[in-house]
Amino acid sequence: MAVTACQGLGFVVSLIGIAGIIAATCMDQWSTQDLYNNPVTAVFNYQGLWRSCVRESSGFTECRGYFTLLGLPAMLQAVRALMIVGIVLGAIGLLVSIFALKCIRIGSMEDSAKANMTLTSGIMFIVSGLCAIAGVSVFANMLVTNFWMSTANMYTGMGGMVQTVQTRYTFGAALFVGWVAGGLTLIGGVMMCIACRGLAPEETNYKAVSYHASGHSVAYKPGGFKASTGFGSNTKNKKIYDGGARTEDEVQSYPSKHDYV
């Protein structure tokens, strides 16, 4: 039961995380105009990965797409790439994890296959989360660098009369969404990897213990017939009757008349 819960929770957390990564990637507020000592501005600038926007005091908002690839900074291109890779890996991970979920039964899929799929999706989520965190962090670093550069020459005097105020940009909401979403995807991936360990069938269900009887040298394996069939280690053996109650996590996936409803 704990494994199913861990796997399910990992899936949900990753799903939320990937939705957040997608949202962050699409958001326009990656960087917003720093208002420093002026909280009310007549013209407010903010920028995303795909377009830059201006919101006027009048309420009018105008957004312009970056209609160039070569003219964009390499760092911005790198951030875009990281976020897209994160989304793609996350989406594939979600697809894989759906089939890996213990609560969903697909044909005669064995637990070992589900365990492998869970591990695969977990790794994909981890990499996806790391890509998002890396992308957001690279952009944040770029902002910090530019912020201090523009602060250094914020007022450039022209003959001592005319001032040109350089627009400074600070962290936008998308950065925080991206960091949180990346973290959630990462956590979800770790949970999936943990669930994988619980899903993977052990080599043998019972450890062999040697008993030295007087006069005879016989190795006794507890579990009788069950052990001799290798039920725990070889799932390809024919199904044997076991009347004992099992927890959901112990149930093996065997085809039955209920599997193809």
Epitope: A42, V43, E56, S58, G59, V162, T167
Partner: antibody, heavy 118, light 113 residues
Framework: QVQLQESGPGLVKPSQTLSLTCTVS?????????WHWIRQPPGKGLEWIGY???????NYNPALRSRVTISVDTSKNQFSLKLSSVTAADTAVYYC???????????WGQGTTVTVSS | DIVMTQSPDSLAYSLGERATINCKSS????????????LTWYQQKPGQPPKLLIY???TRESGVPDRFSGSGSGTDIFITISSLQAEDVAVYYC?????????FGGGTKLEIK
């Protein structure tokens, strides 16, 4: 077409409070725009006083901030200006206006002349 | 506050002539975010409220004759009347629309010679 009309007393005594109201017709004051007050002393240029949004958020000219209060009454489709401790320097034509693209003012009231005199 | 300086205070041109009014700001009105200059031009006739002519320094308001055009960038912006008409006699004001408080130029009175 949005129309604005200022109303209020034409004569105010020094040190008293000037009160003006702008009635908006042909559109709702809750449309999301900022509604402004601008004044023009006789024979001089224009001076921006401040604005109000229908939500009640305001922004005033720092030169007048300590004396200005702009309020809104969405039910009456009106917004008002109060200027306290007036002096002869506050004698002007007071306009209400609505902002639009480029932070420009395409819609103005006809203006109301306010004279500060004892 | 951004100081708007208009020059000259008054101008006289003959009908049909090209008239140009200059507006200088103490700070650049150019916004890099949308590559626009936040300067507005108004025309005011006696006893009337100002009438919007041009916003974003060069965008003509609907209904404004095409003889009116705006140009310039940053701190020096102009309004040009390509062929002066009798009805263009008025006072012209420029407005800083870039930052609060909004400020206006002192006005330029345009007259017929």
């Amino acid at each position: 077409q949005v129309q604005l009309q200022e109303s209020g007393p034409g004569l105010v005594k020094p040190s008293q409070t000037l009160s003006l109201t702008c009635t908006v017709s042909g559109g709702s004051i809750s449309s999301g725009y900022n509604w402004h007050w601008i004044r023009q002393p006789p024979g001089k240029g224009l001076e921006w006083i401040g604005y109000i949004h229908y939500t009640g958020s305001t922004n005033y000219n720092p030169a007048l901030r300590s004396r200005v209060t702009i309020s809104v009454d969405t039910s009456k489709n009106q917004f008002s200006l109060k200027l306290s401790s007036v002096t002869a320097a506050d004698t002007a034509v007071y306009y209400c206006a609505r902002i639009y693209n480029g932070n420009s003012f395409p819609y103005w009231g006809q203006g109301t002349t306010v004279t500060v005199s004892s | 506050d951004i100081v708007m300086t208009q020059s000259p205070d008054s101008l006289a041109y003959s009908l049909g002539e090209r008239a140009t009014i200059n507006c200088k700001s103490s700070q650049s009105l150019f916004n890099s975010g949308n590559q626009k200059n936040y300067l507005t031009w108004y025309q005011q006739k006696p006893g009337q409220p100002p009438k919007l002519l041009i916003y974003w320094a060069s965008t003509r308001e609907s209904g404004v004759p095409d003889r009116f055009s705006g140009s310039g960038s940053g701190t020096d912006i102009f309004i040009t009347i390509s062929s002066l008409q009798a009805e263009d006699v008025a006072v012209y004001y420029c407005q800083n629309a870039y930052s609060f408080p909004y400020t206006f130029g002192g006005g330029t009175k345009l007259e017929i010679k």
